[in-house]
């Protein structure tokens, strides 16, 4: 069976960082030349003489970890025999992905006219690892100019409620900017747009001749 070499590095290591090394011995004592096979992402290079492996591009844990490549050790001169071993690079997570909405929220609506202030619920996510606990996002409006019309309140670490502050909205679409902060190290913030439509309703759904809208909000506080 193939020998497996393993190394562990942070996904944000600088380009040119040594991330591991592979060594082989030739029974006849001949020199060995090392090469990589299967470096599909073009992240690594190997020193042909020493077997040291270096990063040559930004690494990304979210693209897949561990990153598996093969190292080919070939004897120099003689019969040029070679052997293949595995090199597994385990990438440790860095908080490098800002929060985003967990799904497409283009169908959010309120029935117009509002009879009472209404609210709806949305969810955030990101692509980083959350060890020992789930994500702990905080939510706030993206502009103070929205404060007269909207209020955002946290429900839990991933969900928040967007509420209207009054009932005077017109029958049209409003775009509400929301800031989502992941509280990580370093903290990352995403600004997302929630399009909210106020529309005439038929049987609790937005009446649109062209198609059906999903997502029924709660009405009332």
């Amino acid at each position: 069976s193939q020998h497996v070499f393993q190394a562990k590095v942070s996904e944000d290591v600088a380009i040119g960082t040594k991330v591991g090394n592979v060594t082989a011995k030739d029974p006849e004592g001949l020199d060995i030349s090392y090469s990589l096979r299967g470096d599909t992402r073009g992240w690594l290079k190997i020193d042909h003489v020493t077997g040291e492996i270096f990063s040559v591009a930004p690494l990304d844990r979210e693209a897949g970890s561990p990153y598996r490549v093969q190292v080919v050790a070939t004897e120099v001169g003689g019969s040029s025999l070679s052997s293949v071993s595995e090199f597994h690079l385990i990438l440790m997570d860095v908080n490098d992905n800002p929060p985003r909405l967990a799904k497409d929220y283009t169908g959010l609506f309120f029935c117009h006219p509002l009879s009472a202030p209404g609210s709806l619920i949305f969810e955030a996510t990101d692509d980083d690892q959350h060890l020992f606990r789930g994500p702990h996002f905080t939510f706030s409006l993206g502009s103070g100019s929205l404060q007269n019309d909207w209020e955002v309140s946290k429900i839990n670490g991933t969900h928040a409620r967007l509420s209207t502050r009054h009932t005077e909205f017109e029958e049209r679409e409003y775009v509400v900017l929301i800031r989502i902060n992941d509280g990580g190290r370093p903290p990352l913030e995403g600004i997302v747009s929630l399009p909210v439509t106020f529309c005439s309703c038929v049987e609790g759904s937005c009446f649109r001749p062209a198609g059906h809208q999903t997502g029924i909000p709660t009405v009332g506080m």
Epitope: S140, S143, G144, S145, Q147, N148, D149, H166, E168, F169, E170, R172, Y174, R179, N181, E189
Partner: antibody, heavy 115, light 108 residues
Framework: QVQLVQSGAEVKKPGASVKVSCKAS????????MHWVKQAPGQRLEWIGE????????NYNQKFKGKATLTVDKSASTAYMELSSLRSEDTAVYYC????????WGQGTTVTVSS | EIVLTQSPDFQSVTPKEKVTITCSVS???????LHWYQQKPDQSPKLLIK???NLASGVPSRFSGSGSGTDFTLTINSLEAEDAATYYC?????????FGQGTRLEIK
Amino acid sequence: QVQLVQSGAEVKKPGASVKVSCKASGYTFTTYWMHWVKQAPGQRLEWIGEIDPSDSYANYNQKFKGKATLTVDKSASTAYMELSSLRSEDTAVYYCALYYGYGDWGQGTTVTVSS
Amino acid sequence: EIVLTQSPDFQSVTPKEKVTITCSVSSSISSIHLHWYQQKPDQSPKLLIKRTSNLASGVPSRFSGSGSGTDFTLTINSLEAEDAATYYCQQGSNLPLTFGQGTRLEIK
């Protein structure tokens, strides 16, 4: 009741900087964004930007990026606007205002830039 | 940015007259995002009407507002001497927030 009290008039030389303060009282300072507005002589009101006192996140009018810097001191319930590289066209009255409720403005701070 | 254009720039009127100031918006906005302010010399702007038609606290009922989309109006019925001021419309639909150029009312 809400009160926004601004620092006094300033006279500055071209190229200098000035920092205008806005002391808030009568409400929880971190709850509402603070806005800043410029009124040059004979000109319309111009929105400079806004800052969320809870975490100092700010939005700026593109026209004032690099000119104005908005900050807050939560412990003192005070918002600040610093204007850098002053020129004669920065001569104006500057207001802090709470856009929440639309109605609360500071008394204004006159900044005069003159050599 | 959204541009607000007021008309007229200046008006000289006699007491008890009816005054109409218009505010034309460069792109359609919701009526909840259009507000009117009054400013007297050496004073801060004072909120007059919020969300197109809602009178601010303490504002006399002779002031009223209307409109939708791109055309909004401030009306003063039976003008009084104390109404001499500059009036501004303002939109809060998009950043940057923008104001009209102002309409100065003079009492004859």
